[in-house]
């Protein structure tokens, strides 16, 4: 069903302090700028669908410029609180505290929000990524230490009149970028308490947000290059699938990883790509300007619709899950790292499908909108999409129910 | 500038273990894979296995998969090749590489002697 | 496992010359091949990669080509500092392989 009724108050179809307001890359993550305290210290922070805790980093790193300085803020306050969020690899630990917060490029309001403070991390901070914390805009549910810890956009909603709504158009360079381009470059933009229209092409298509922890849905069916991938829809679901902002790759399930790789090897044939390329160990390169797109399948995920038995499909390119990668050796060449690879913790979409689209969280009214983004990188013979409506039947038979334990849900 | 510094020689009794280091730099650690590979003279190369930086997965040539243990630390960029069980048949040079295409870079070399 | 065969462990050759080392694959590996150089006490460096791209910096003297099972290093007008021993590699399949050398000699 498509998003052609009069938009809400508030939901007006121009943003334009917020377009443009992200900048990075998918394999480090895009970030936006915030300020934190009073007076204002300025950090760029990661922008994560995939976690709910908004957390900077409190004190010298190797891999941080700068960081956030709470003596120097008169306005924290202490909530005597630590928190420790360990990751299947690496960790953050941090103490609790609320401050103003405010996001020059969003909407002109101030905040008192939580933030953990990051004190010890390992394996979290990027060097080079230039971002110096982390914003987890999905819900209290996935919070650390517990649920009864706010989300920012929580606080944000609650303390102000933004609507409660944000929508993410990630902007894939298509070539890799150094350093300096990064500084530089235009990541994207996250609009916040709204949709801009001039983001996107086409129809906003939307799919129901399953439950309200990490941004969940659900996929029905999989398509490469149109052949079906024929698989038992609950296997596509298993354990979960998720929106993940703050992931790179697509990531697949073990058996369906396995069939779509099967798949796109088969339609890929012509070309014989090392097995380690499949792994994202090998980079395959092709002269400058030479990459053969055209021998790479389109990938469609069809995800359950807003209308009983109806679904909608979201295509993309090679150009979205070849990720551009820059190696010195290699310098003369386009070379391209495979972005597709397997979990075992559910189906995340991330940059590599959002690269693709228009994502709208539309949390007031429990559902995700994709649209075909202004900015994908595409060729002249194939475009992403978002394509409906299709009969879909038993989709709520797709969805996987986990058993419920205290195991932690951020082991990923 | 792209560089792999290996750990100095190593000369170790026959029995013991050893535990050899390569610390990258002037690149994204987490973005490529790191490769050790095994060389004793006139014995040409031999791949030993590789780790992802990323998340720390690991593949072995079975070859030396009771043998070699790759780790990782990435707060300080470094690769570990801890070798076990270690016979005279173990003395070799051994190099890091980093993935690319193939190995476009290669540490400097580490030299492990098995002596009693 | 894949083996790499260079059947020439010795090759001598003039400063000036042209000449070409060869690498036999026991299965198809496409053009998933790499060339390195190893001078004495030194590193390996890379040459070529997917069998006949040079990488950044070495010189076009330097050529690779070949596919499938058959594989050949091209030095023309070799050089005194060529004195090495090349090695092939196949990144085709785990585990990676390498072919047992080829030194050259310069007369």
């Known amino acids: 069903e498509t998003d052609e009724e009069p938009e809400e108050p508030g939901r007006r179809g121009s943003f334009v302090e917020m377009v443009d307001n992200l900048r990075g890359k998918s394999g480090q993550g895009y970030y936006v700028e915030m300020t934190v305290g009073s007076p204002p210290q300025t950090l760029n922070i990661l922008v994560d669908t995939g976690s709910s805790n908004f957390a900077v980093g409190a004190a010298p790193h190797p891999f941080l410029h700068r960081y956030y300085q709470r003596q120097l803020s008169s306005t924290y306050r202490d909530l005597r609180k630590g928190v420790y969020v360990p990751y299947t690899q690496g960790k953050w630990e941090g103490e609790l505290g609320t401050d103003l917060v405010s996001i020059p490029h969003g909407p002109n309001v101030t905040v008192r929000a939580n933030i953990a403070a990051i004190t010890e991390s390992d394996k979290f901070f990027i060097n080079g990524s230039n971002w110096e914390g982390i914003l987890g805009l999905a819900y209290a549910e996935i919070a650390r230490p517990d649920d009864s810890l706010e989300p920012f956009f929580d606080s944000l909603v609650k303390q102000t009149h933004v609507p409660n709504l944000f929508s993410l158009q990630l902007c894939g360079a298509g070539f890799p970028l150094n350093q300096s381009e990064v500084l530089a470059s235009v990541g994207g933009s996250m609009i916040i308490g709204g949709i801009d229209h001039s983001l996107y092409t086409g129809s906003l298509w939307y799919t129901p947000i399953r439950r309200e922890w990490y941004y969940e849905v659900i996929i029905v069916r999989v398509e490469i290059n149109g052949q079906d991938l024929k698989m038992d829809c609950k296997e596509y679901n298993y354990d979960k699938s998720i929106v993940d902002s703050g992931t790179t790759n697509l990531r697949l399930p073990k058996k369906v990883f396995e069939a779509a790789v099967k798949s796109i090897k088969a339609a890929s044939s012509t070309e014989k790509f090392p097995d380690g390329f499949w792994l994202g160990e090998q980079l395959v390169c092709w002269q400058a300007g030479t990459t053969p797109w055209n021998i790479f399948p389109v990938i469609s995920l069809y995800l359950m619709g807003e209308v009983t038995n109806q679904s909608f499909r979201i295509t993309i390119l090679p150009q979205q899950y070849l990720r551009p990668v820059e190696d010195v050796a290699t310098s003369q060449d386009d070379c391209y790292k495979f972005a597709i690879s397997q979990s075992s913790t559910g189906t995340v979409m991330g940059a590599v499908i959002m690269e693709g689209f228009y994502v709208v969280f539309d949390r007031a009214r429990k559902r995700i909108g994709f649209a075909v983004s202004a900015c994908h990188v595409h060729d002249e013979f194939r475009t992403a999409a978002v394509e409906g409506p299709f009969v879909t039947l038993d989709m709520e038979d797709c969805g996987y129910n986990i058993p419920q334990t205290d195991e932690s849900t951020l082991m990923t | 500038e792209v560089q792999l510094q290996q750990s100095g020689a190593e000369l170790v009794r026959p029995g013991t273990s050893v535990k050899l280091s390569c610390k990258a730099s002037?690149?994204?650690?987490?973005s490529y894979w790191i490769h050790w590979v095994k060389q004793r003279p006139g014995q040409g190369l031999e791949w030993?296995?590789?780790?992802?930086?990323?998340?720390?997965?690991?593949k072995y040539n079975q070859k030396f998969k009771d043998k070699a243990t790759l780790t990782v630390d990435t707060s300080s960029s470094t690769t570990y090749m801890h070798l076990s069980s270690l016979t005279s048949e173990d003395s070799a040079v051994y190099y890091c590489?980093?993935?690319?295409?193939?190995?476009?870079?290669w540490g400097q070399r580490t030299l492990v002697t098995v002596s009693a | 496992d894949i083996v790499m065969t260079q059947s020439q462990k010795f090759m001598s050759t003039s400063v000036g010359d042209r000449v070409s080392i060869t690498c036999k694959a026991s299965?198809?590996?496409?053009?998933?091949v790499a060339w390195y150089q190893q001078k004495p006490g030194q590193s390996p460096k890379a040459l070529i990669y997917?069998?006949?791209y040079r990488y950044s910096g070495v010189p076009d003297r330097f050529t690779g080509s070949g596919s499938g099972t058959d594989f050949t290093l091209t030095i023309s007008n070799v050089q005194s500092e060529d004195l090495a021993e090349y090695f092939c590699q196949q990144y085709n399949s785990y585990p990676y392989t390498f072919g047992g050398g080829t030194k050259l000699e310069i007369k």
């Open positions: 997917s069998a006949s």
């Open positions: 590489a980093r993935s690319g295409v193939a190995f476009p870079y």
């Open positions: 030993i296995g590789m780790i992802d930086p990323s998340d720390s997965y690991t």
């Open positions: 002037g690149y994204t650690f987490t």
């Open positions: 299965q198809n590996v496409g053009t998933n």
